[in-house]
Interface confidence: medium
């Protein structure tokens, strides 16, 4: 028996359902009584879901997995993972045994889009050209880690005096805070771009300083 899975990682958004595709080619006369199907975490060998002795043995992994029972006889051994969490990310191995056995691994990449950045300025009043200001760009609840880019009003990258930190919350999602320290010109726009490298999603924020008032 030959097992086939998708070579590319499966990308799933947090809190959505994902299908880890796995298939095999049943011989003529194949019946489910002959099938032993096991899904497990590749690294730890933890059992995720199994079908043995002619029946679905159910989820061994937080009760969020399911097979496609009506499609098993056609060779579809795919696994449905519901309400995906960050902690589900990783490699899953599909083992199929009929008379002989084969296995293959499929990777699950979890992702979550970042919120539109909020911009704060310190100090935020009595600003004059030549003043040193701190601009903070904050974006929330994304996954995986963000890449953060700063640009001035002419689109020139600002790389000096930038400090970016990322904090994982209880769900494993990241809040990103990027701080730019810059000397004010006569006026200017400062933009921050927060990029999710898996989703290729960009979230933009900017602040324009033209004396008073400030524009966000």
């Amino acid at each position: 028996v030959e097992v086939q899975v998708s070579e590319d990682p499966v990308v799933a958004l947090v809190d959505t359902d994902a299908t880890l595709r796995c298939s095999f080619s049943p011989e003529p006369g194949f019946s489910l009584a002959q099938l032993n199907l096991i899904w497990q975490l590749t690294d730890t060998k933890q059992l995720v879901h199994s079908f043995t002795e002619g029946r679905d043995q159910g989820s061994a992994y937080s009760n969020r997995t399911a097979l496609f029972p009506d499609l098993l006889v056609q060779g579809n051994a795919s696994l449905r993972l519901q309400r995906v969490r960050v902690t589900d990310e990783g490699s899953y191995t599909c083992f199929v045994s009929i008379q002989d056995f084969d296995s293959a691994a499929v990777s699950l990449q979890v992702a979550a889009p970042y919120s539109k950045p909020s911009m704060t300025l310190e100090p935020n009043k009595d600003l004059r050209p030549g003043n040193m200001v701190t601009i903070t760009c904050s974006s929330y609840q994304g996954y995986p880690e963000a890449e953060v880019f700063w640009k001035d009003g002419q689109g020139v990258p600002l790389t000096g005096n930038v400090t970016t930190s990322q904090m994982a919350n209880e769900r494993g999602l990241f809040d990103v805070h990027s701080v730019l320290r810059v000397v004010l010109g006569a006026n200017g726009t400062y933009s921050c771009l927060v990029r999710n490298p898996v989703l290729q999603q960009d979230a933009h924020g900017s602040v324009t300083i033209t004396g008073q008032p400030l524009t966000f």
Partner: antibody, heavy 120, light 108 residues
């Protein structure tokens, strides 16, 4: 079996450059976050730089602008390019694998380390 | 940056005794804390992660507890191979990942 083997350490003068390598086996390097952690003689552990599975790079403030982390997925190797070396960079440099692509950033596997000595 | 402070710096005990090592974080890191053991001339070895979970192959005499800012590694009935330096590490707020300064457990 997961294995990490560092190489490229040696003795250099202040201001010079050095590139460290970490050959990984038993796992795919772009499926995990991998870091460089150093330990100065008789001192504690200091995280230096890391790269996530998705390719996002991180640096400690003490090396930002001087060190560059990279990886070659085709030969499953991690690198640390160290420029403008200083005496305080003298340490054993360990390559360490996180147990996840990103966020669970504790280190479940470590190499044996390679010694970098910066001295005039 | 989250600063981790380990105490005591050195713990002098006899085999069979219980070792209690402390790690304090400068702000809450929930339960995102790991413990490592390091012997002279060797790389660190993961003991505990997520504050309480023992890594693969780590004996049951090692246990972790705590949350927020106060964490403890307990070694029940010290064996000769347990005399080493122990480091805590946080992975909640980063970069940078930060380590404590270490506690040396030495034989009395």
């Amino acid at each position: 079996d997961v294995q990490l083997v560092e190489s490229g350490g040696g003795v250099v003068r202040p201001g010079e450059s050095l590139t460290l390598s970490c050959a990984a086996s038993g796992f795919t390097i772009n499926s995990y976050a991998v870091s460089w952690v150093r330990q100065a003689p008789g001192e504690g552990l200091e995280w230096v730089s890391g790269i996530s599975g998705s390719g996002v790079r991180y640096y400690a403030d003490s090396v930002k602008g001087r060190f560059t982390i990279s990886r070659d997925n085709s030969n499953n190797t991690l690198y640390l390019q160290m420029n403008s070396l200083r005496a305080e960079d003298t340490a054993v440099y360990y390559c360490a694998r996180s147990n996840k692509v990103t966020w669970n950033n504790f280190f479940d596997y470590w190499g044996l380390g390679t010694l970098v000595t910066v001295s005039s | 940056e989250v600063v981790l402070t380990q105490s005591p710096g050195t713990l002098t005990l006899s085999p069979g005794e219980r070792a209690t090592l402390s790690c304090r974080a400068s702000r809450s890191i929930l339960t995102s804390l790991a413990w490592y053991q390091q012997k002279p001339g060797q790389a660190p070895r993961l003991l505990i992660y997520n504050t309480v979970t023992r890594a693969t192959g780590i004996p049951a005499r090692f246990s972790g507890s705590g949350s927020g800012t106060e964490f403890t590694l307990t070694i029940n009935s010290l064996q000769s191979e347990d005399f080493a330096v122990y480091y805590c590490q946080q992975y909640y707020d980063w970069p940078p990942l930060t380590f404590g300064g270490g506690t040396k457990v030495e034989i009395k």
